[in-house]
């Protein structure tokens, strides 16, 4: 596709080189069951995603591979994610001390950008919430969405504070997407 | 800025067939007081909406009718909704047992797609939250938004777990929208 | 506006005048430490923002000045904001009575439009939540986003119920943006 810098002729009126909206990079990814993976103590684990079944899709050179969305073209993208968390609150402090409770102090989602030429990931969006549910079963979503200028080759991922609390049961509850504006 | 009505020349450079952004189907609907309706036990009721007063609008063949947004053209749409819920927590278990309490166990919003050729709706987005408020008055929003490939003739609606808990008092608190990307 | 079916001149293919997507007004603003300001009792204070460092940017005549985003061109805009609130819950009612507690009854974000020719601001979006956290430290985000028809010269701001509760520590936690569709 023409990139938008090559404009045209000598007369007054100026026209856009072809950039049909339908050919812009776009993706909507949906949750899958997560396989527990080793991760560093202070680093949140990344989720992996369904990219072609059900409501999920990638198109126009936006590819998904190994937990990352690959940005195929520089530009301004709207990026969004929702993660639904759920767990069980054990009321007894004895139970709570024995092993890791399923009632955390907080839940966090981070949308992160990785650039190969730069060692440190950039946190684009963070949603973080203290958890003070008192019932035995609790669940709640965290939604994020915003616009960022990305470069060709950038990679996007979604990290969470505790992968075991992510609700992977339905594609409409936990998802991740991006589209070129 | 050029407004999209002035068209163009005969030379080589390639141009996009007319799709001025301003002519894309778009809608932003706002809350109205809901009339309680009969609905099946395991089916969440659909909200109805204001589509032309105040901040609400529909344009470019995106029409609203009978709780549904009608998709006039196939393509990728960004769809969003916020529903603000509110209720009163009755602390007394006697009061709680007498009649339905206004403090539910959970609140849920679902954005649903209906295709005429198929009886079963498809859930596109769901925001669901356990409610463990302890104060007497509680209120909170659930926000959803994502991109989906829709077909001409698809219909979108917003369903909620309990219509009586929806805050219909202000157009900025509870809303529903979609636009072709 | 042309409705999409009625195209134009005598030759077959019709072309759009230049509106490269890259030249549309866009902004993503990020949180900065707020300077407490005088505000009227029933009016929520406006946040001010970073507009050019880190992830923040304004482009294509979308300007930020004095807490406002200035709309340079009429059209339909997607507007969004997230505000992360945090505070300390003092359990003791004595402490709570002495001075203002850092545990409010509710937290609210409003995205507001100001039109010079109209004296009264218009609330476009509101996210409001009762706070019933029981732990000593609490934090949570409120996210908003929707599409509105704006006029050249309109100004947008974000108001909050209590500026002292806004988490200004990270640009990914509290932000505000808009882009022309």
């Amino acid at each position: 596709a023409l990139k938008g810098q090559e404009f045209a002729p000598s007369h007054q009126q100026v026209y856009a080189p072809l950039r049909a909206d339908g050919d812009k990079p776009r993706a909507h990814l949906t949750v899958v069951r997560q396989t527990p993976t080793q991760h560093f103590k202070n680093q949140f684990p990344a989720l992996h995603w369904e990219h072609e079944l059900g409501l999920a899709f990638t198109k126009n050179r936006m590819n998904y591979t190994n937990k990352f969305l690959l940005i195929p073209e520089s530009g301004d993208y709207f990026i969004y994610s929702q993660v639904t968390f759920r767990g069980m609150t054990s009321e007894s402090s004895e139970i709570r001390q024995a092993g890791r409770p399923n009632k955390p102090d907080s839940i966090t989602v981070v949308i992160t950008k990785v650039t190969d030429s730069y060692p440190e990931p950039t946190q684009l969006l963070m949603g973080t919430k203290s958890v003070s549910e008192v019932g035995s079963n609790w669940f709640q979503p965290i939604y994020l969405g915003a616009m960022f200028s990305l470069q060709e080759g950038d990679k996007l991922m979604v990290n969470v504070s505790d992968i075991s609390l992510v609700d992977y049961t339905k594609e409409d509850k936990t998802f991740f997407g991006a589209f070129l504006l | 800025a050029l407004k999209g009505q002035e068209f163009a020349p005969s030379h080589q450079q390639v141009y996009a067939p007319l799709r001025a952004d301003g002519d894309k189907p778009r809608a932003h609907l706002t809350v109205v007081r809901q009339t309680p309706t009969q609905h099946f036990k395991n089916q969440f009721p659909a909200l109805h909406w204001e589509h032309e007063l105040g901040l609400a609008f529909t344009k470019n063949r995106m029409n609203y009718t009978n709780k549904f947004l009608l998709i006039p053209e196939s393509g990728d749409y960004f769809i969003y909704s916020q529903v603000t819920f509110r209720g009163m927590t009755s602390e007394s278990s006697e009061i709680r047992q007498a009649g339905r309490p206004n403090k539910p166990d959970s609140i849920t919003v679902v954005i649903t797609k209906v295709t005429d050729s198929y009886p079963e709706p498809t859930q596109l987005l769901m925001g669901t939250k356990s409610v463990s408020e302890v104060g007497s008055n509680w209120f909170q929003p659930i926000y959803l938004g994502a991109m989906f490939s829709l077909q001409e003739g698809d219909k979108l609606m917003v369903n909620v777990s309990d219509i009586s808990l929806v805050d219909y008092t202000k157009e900025d608190k509870t809303f529903f929208g979609a636009f072709l990307l | 506006a042309l409705k999409g079916q009625e195209f134009a001149p005598s030759h077959q293919q019709v072309y759009a005048p230049l509106r490269a997507d890259g030249d549309k007004p866009r902004a993503h603003l990020t949180v900065v430490r707020q300077t407490p300001t005088q505000h009227f009792k029933n009016q929520f204070p406006a946040l001010h923002w970073e507009h050019e460092l880190g992830l923040a940017f304004t482009k294509n005549r979308m300007n930020y000045t004095n807490k406002f985003l200035l709309i340079p061109e009429s059209g339909d805009y997607f507007i969004y904001s997230q505000v992360t609130f945090r505070g300390m819950t003092s359990e003791s009612s004595e402490i709570r009575q002495a001075g203002r507690p850092n545990k409010p009854d509710s937290i609210t974000v409003v995205i507001t439009k100001v039109t010079d020719s109209y004296p009264e601001p218009t609330q476009l979006l509101m996210g409001t939540k009762s706070v019933s956290e029981v732990g000593s430290n609490w934090f949570q985000p409120i996210y908003l986003g929707a599409m509105f028809s704006l006029q050249e010269g309109d100004k947008l701001m974000v108001n909050v119920s209590d500026i002292s509760l806004v988490d200004y520590t990270k640009e990914d936690k509290t932000f505000f943006g808009a882009f022309l569709l």
Epitope: R33, G54, L55, K59, Y168, E171 | T122, S149 | -
Partner: antibody
Framework: QVQLVQSGAEVKKPGASVKVSCKAS????????ISWVRQAPGQGLEWMGW????????HYARMLQGRVTMTTDTSTRTAYMELRSLRSDDTAVYYC?????????????????WGQGTTVTVSS | EIVLTQSPATLSLSPGERATLSCRAS??????LAWYQQKPGQAPRLLIY???NRATGIPARFSGSGSGTDFTLTISSLEPEDFAVYYC?????????FGQGTKVEIK
């Protein structure tokens, strides 16, 4: 009810192409992918490829790459499979099948609805 | 691509007997394995999805188990209509692949 109806039997000469259609009814066509499976006389099932009815993405069996093209027409709720440069060993019954998906990250499902099959005979 | 090997190739049993069919994958397919039944002149029918979940309308005598590389389809008590060819299919990695089939015939 949910069904897939395929086009009729075809007889083709080696080197020719064949295009088999598969019309869906009774369900949301764009939600479920379509796989194509073939079965040569007296042989087992061979998966040929898959197409997303949602956005047209495809995956093909390696052996058929370059010779097979799968497409869909959402307006008529029809999937198509075209096989080019036919050889005698392409003689088979060709099935389309709906790839069920339960909308859950816990499951991958299976091919739960099948067409009646289309016999393609390649003979000089 | 992932190769699925079914055994035995043929199983000769009488009605009322228990049938145990095996499917082994050349690499892990997690639980993403389906079983199909095919009778002569008919299209295949989905029996089991995701290793152990019975498809709609499938009788309880059919059950599936296993994960990773080793899977089993069990028919607890063979009915006359169960004599057919059974195929496993992996749905973990593209390209999807089928096993070569196990024929369950009347002894």
């Amino acid at each position: 009810q949910v069904q897939l109806v395929q086009s009729g039997a075809e007889v083709k000469k080696p080197g020719a192409s064949v295009k088999v259609s598969c019309k869906a009814s009774g369900y949301d066509f764009t939600y479920y992918g379509i796989s194509w499976v073939r079965q040569a006389p007296g042989q087992g099932l061979e998966w040929m490829g898959w197409i997303s009815t949602y956005n047209g993405n495809t995956h093909y069996a390696r052996m058929l790459q370059g010779r097979v093209t799968m497409t869909t027409d959402t307006s008529t709720r029809t999937a198509y499979m075209e096989l080019r440069s036919l050889r005698s060993d392409d003689t088979a019954v060709y099935y389309c099948a709906r790839e069920t998906y339960y909308g859950s990250g816990a499951y991958r499902g299976g091919m739960d609805v099948w067409g009646q099959g289309t016999t393609v005979t390649v003979s000089s | 691509e992932i190769v699925l090997t079914q055994s035995p190739a043929t199983l000769s049993l009488s009605p009322g007997e228990r049938a145990t069919l095996s499917c082994r994958a050349s690499q892990s397919v997690s639980s993403y394995l389906a079983w199909y039944q095919q009778k002569p002149g008919q299209a295949p029918r989905l029996l089991i999805y995701d290793a152990s979940n019975r498809a709609t309308g499938i009788p309880a005598r059919f059950s599936g188990s296993g994960s990773g590389t080793d899977f089993t389809l069990t028919i607890s008590s063979l009915e006359p209509e169960d004599f057919a060819v059974y195929y496993c299919q992996q749905r973990s990695n593209w390209p999807w692949t089928f096993g070569q089939g196990t024929k369950v015939e009347i002894k």
